[in-house]
Each structure stands twice: as structure tokens, then as C-alpha cells.
């Protein structure tokens, strides 16, 4: 089997890491410096990865594998496999076209990526505003205010319906 | 058939250079990877690296880097390998090989084999 | 670098045993793609260089009897000698085969009672 599978197929016989040259008499071949073949078979290896400028290497390419990049400080990684980095903004600000940016009143942001977000509207689950938000934290919703007063129903009507969004005033 | 010849015996001094030899007949010699191994006395096998003959592309072991240079003479169908600053731990059988047909197929052709001995 | 470990170091039989030397890699030497392990065996006997015996963990190499016998597969591979005879005193070696540094196992020195 292995002999006939050679001969239908010479090609099928170099591993990951070589290409395949049917134009020598040894049809497989190592990868060149700086390039790879993951599948072996192949009639080129591809070329490595280089991460250069704000991408840094976080795994080194082989001759089976490429390169893996990742960002270097105050970026992170956007895009399937790291393909773009992005400028890090602190905690409370948003990146716009022009920069980082503030979040604006009624929205935070806990993270140094990623835009800001309204702040929760504790009362559209019936429940009043323990802690006050930030640009960097949320509001941390309590009790509603008739669960606070003595003798108080236990059952709490519901809140009037308002446009999500709004921040408790 | 592939043969391989390698060059003689060699008797050197501590901190010289030897440059063996592995002269090829009956195949073509710039179609096959040329590999080297290291063989001490009693001891296992080592792969010190290979060479492309068609263009001198080189493959080394990390742990020869420093210490192994290899080439070819297209015109004679010849390798060859220096070793520089030896030792005693250098003292060795050294083989040139080739694989055997495709290429990460076994290596089938051997030389008979240098014989280096580092001694003051 | 991949290393390759065999076992055991030695081993004394009478002409006719069953024989079998076991070599596994640090890492796997089964290429997906063609689903191929690249594990070759060889012997070498005293004052020779090595001969190779069986190539991709299982393809026995022209020439070499069929008392000999390779299997396995990723990281754990075998060389079976199915019944000893005396010409079969030597040295067997594994190699990963599959990338460079193209590394040997430690080697299993065979010695016939």
C-alpha cells in the first residue's frame, strides 16, 4: 500500500515542514529559512509571519508552523489571529477616530478597550441605585424603594415602563 | 547504485581543523540532501546537519553550529566538512549519508565512515 | 528538539526469540496529512556504518528479511524481530525522521546466548 500510494503520488510523501519539487530527484525538500509548510504535500512552503512594529512574537515561526503575533504594550489584539492591533485607552474612555476619548456622562467603560456603555437603569427592574456609576464602574442597582419601607408589600408593583438607555437622575 | 567515499583517518591536534571528505558516484550528486553524522567510540549517532548540493542551503544542528562548516564541489561530486577548535570530545567516526529515494524516507546510503582522533 | 528514547540499552536471547525494541519520541512523528509516521530503524553492526531497515514506522527496506518488523504510531513505535538468528548481533537505532535535527534514539545492543 505505502509503495503504491508513493507511486501514485510522490507528493505525498513529504511531510509538514518540507515542499514537494518533482523537478529534482529528491522531490522533498526542507522548508526554506523563514517559511513553513503546516500539511506537508505541499508544492511551496508559505511565507513566516514576521511581527515587526507595534505586533511582537509571541511564538516563534518553524518550519511546521507560523509565526504568532500578539501586541506590544499599551495595544491590544483586534481580528482573527491578531491581524490588527489597537491603541489601548484607559478605564473610563472609548478610542474614536481622533483618540481616547472620555466616556460621557451616563456611560462607562471598565475596560481599556471596547467603547463605553450606559450605565444600568436600575429602575426598569423595579430596583433603586445603591452605588452611583463612574466612567469606569456601572451603578450597582439595590432593593426597590419599597422593599426599604416597613410593612411594605411584598409584592412590588411594576416599574413604569422608560426608554432604556436613560441613567437614574 | 549510490556510493559514498570518505577521505582517511585523520590525527589532530587539540584547537586545529580537520576538513573531511565524501566523494559521490552513481546518482546525481545536486539532487539529493547531503547529511553528516558524528559517531563516538562505544557510543550512539548524532546528526550534525545536511547541505543541498544544488545550491549549498544548509541545515545545522544547534549543538554544531560552532563547530561544523559544510560545502560542496559540484564539479567533483564531493562534500565536505570542517571542523574547527576540536577537543577530545571530537574524537569520532564521521559519516556523510543520503536518504533514500523521496526524502524523509530513511537514510539508506552511508560512507564507510572517518575515523578523527583529537590527541596531543 | 525532538528526543527520542529507546528500551532497553540491551538485551542477551537465544537464536530463535522473539525480540522487540521499543523507541518513543518526545513528540508526535505522525503527520497528519498523509497520516504517515516518519520513525526509521536502523542496524548497524560492529566496525559498519548503519543500515537502514524499515523506514515510516512500517515499510521494510528492499533487501532486508522479513523477520524483521516495525510498528506504532505518534509517539510510541516498535521493532519486532520475530525469531533471532545469529547474524542479527548489532546495534538498533530509532530516528525521528520527520524533522530536523533529525535525531537517533540511544541505540539497543542485541547479543546472542
Known amino acids: 500500500f505505502e509503495r503504491t500510494r508513493s507511486l501514485q503520488d510522490p507528493c505525498s510523501n513529504c511531510p509538514a515542514g518540507t515542499f514537494c519539487d518533482n523537478n529534482r530527484n529528491q522531490i522533498c525538500s526542507p522548508c526554506p529559512p523563514n517559511s513553513f509548510s503546516s500539511a506537508g504535500g505541499q508544492r511551496t512552503c508559505d511565507i513566516c509571519r514576521q511581527c515587526k512594529g507595534v505586533f511582537r512574537t509571541r511564538k516563534e515561526c518553524s518550519s511546521t508552523s507560523n509565526a504568532e503575533c500578539d501586541c506590544t504594550p499599551g495595544f491590544h489584539c483586534l481580528g482573527a489571529g491578531c491581524s490588527m492591533c489597537e491603541q489601548d485607552c484607559k478605564q473610563g474612555q472609548e478610542l474614536t477616530k481622533k483618540g481616547c476619548k472620555d466616556c460621557c456622562f451616563g456611560t462607562f467603560n471598565d475596560q481599556k478597550r471596547g467603547i463605553c456603555r450606559p450605565w444600568t437603569n436600575c429602575s426598569l427592574d423595579g430596583k433603586s441605585v445603591l452605588v452611583n456609576g463612574t466612567k469606569e464602574r456601572d451603578v450597582v442597582c439595590g432593593p426597590s424603594p419599597a422593599d426599604l419601607s416597613p410593612g411594605a408589600s411584598s409584592v412590588t408593583p411594576p416599574a413604569p415602563a422608560r426608554e432604556p438607555g436613560h441613567s437614574p437622575q | 547504485q549510490a556510493q559514498l567515499q570518505q577521505s582517511g583517518p585523520e590525527l589532530v591536534r587539540p584547537g586545529t581543523s580537520v576538513k573531511m571528505s565524501c566523494k559521490t558516484s552513481?546518482?546525481?550528486?545536486?539532487?539529493?540532501?547531503m547529511h553528516w553524522m558524528k559517531q563516538r567510540p562505544g557510543q550512539g549517532l548524532e546528526w550534525i546537519g545536511m547541505i543541498d548540493p544544488s545550491n549549498s542551503d544548509t541545515r545545522l544542528n544547534q549543538k554544531f553550529k560552532d563547530k561544523a562548516t559544510l560545502n560542496v564541489d559540484k564539479s567533483s561530486n564531493t562534500a565536505y566538512m570542517d571542523f574547527s577548535s576540536l577537543t577530545s570530545e571530537d574524537s569520532a567516526v564521521y559519516y556523510c549519508?543520503?536518504?533514500?529515494?523521496?526524502?524523509?524516507?530513511?537514510?539508506?546510503?552511508w560512507g564507510q565512515g572517518t575515523l578523527v582522533t583529537v590527541s596531543a | 528538539d525532538i528526543v527520542m528514547t529507546q528500551s532497553p540499552s540491551s538485551l542477551t536471547v537465544t537464536a530463535g526469540e522473539k525480540v522487540t525494541v521499543s523507541c518513543k519520541s518526545s513528540q508526535s512523528l505522525l503527520n497528519s496529512g498523509n497520516q504517515r509516521n516518519y520513525l526509521t530503524w536502523y542496524q548497524q553492526k560492529p566496525g559498519q556504518p548503519p543500515k537502514l531497515l524499515i523506514y515510516w514506522a512500517s515499510t521494510r527496506e528492499s533487501g532486508v528479511p522479513d523477520h524483521f518488523t516495525g510498528s506504532g504510531s505518534g509517539t510510541d513505535f516498535t521493532l519486532t524481530i520475530s525469531s533471532v538468528q545469529a547474524e542479527d548481533l548489532a546495534v538498533y537505532y530509532c530516528?525521528?525522521?520527520?524533522?530536523?535535527?533529525?535525531?537517533f534514539g540511544g541505540g539497543t545492543k542485541l547479543e546472542i546466548k
Open positions: 552513481g546518482y546525481s550528486f545536486t539532487g539529493y540532501w
Open positions: 530516528q525521528n525522521d520527520y524533522t530536523y535535527p533529525f535525531t
Open positions: 549519508a543520503r536518504w533514500r529515494y523521496y526524502g524523509y524516507d530513511g537514510i539508506a546510503y
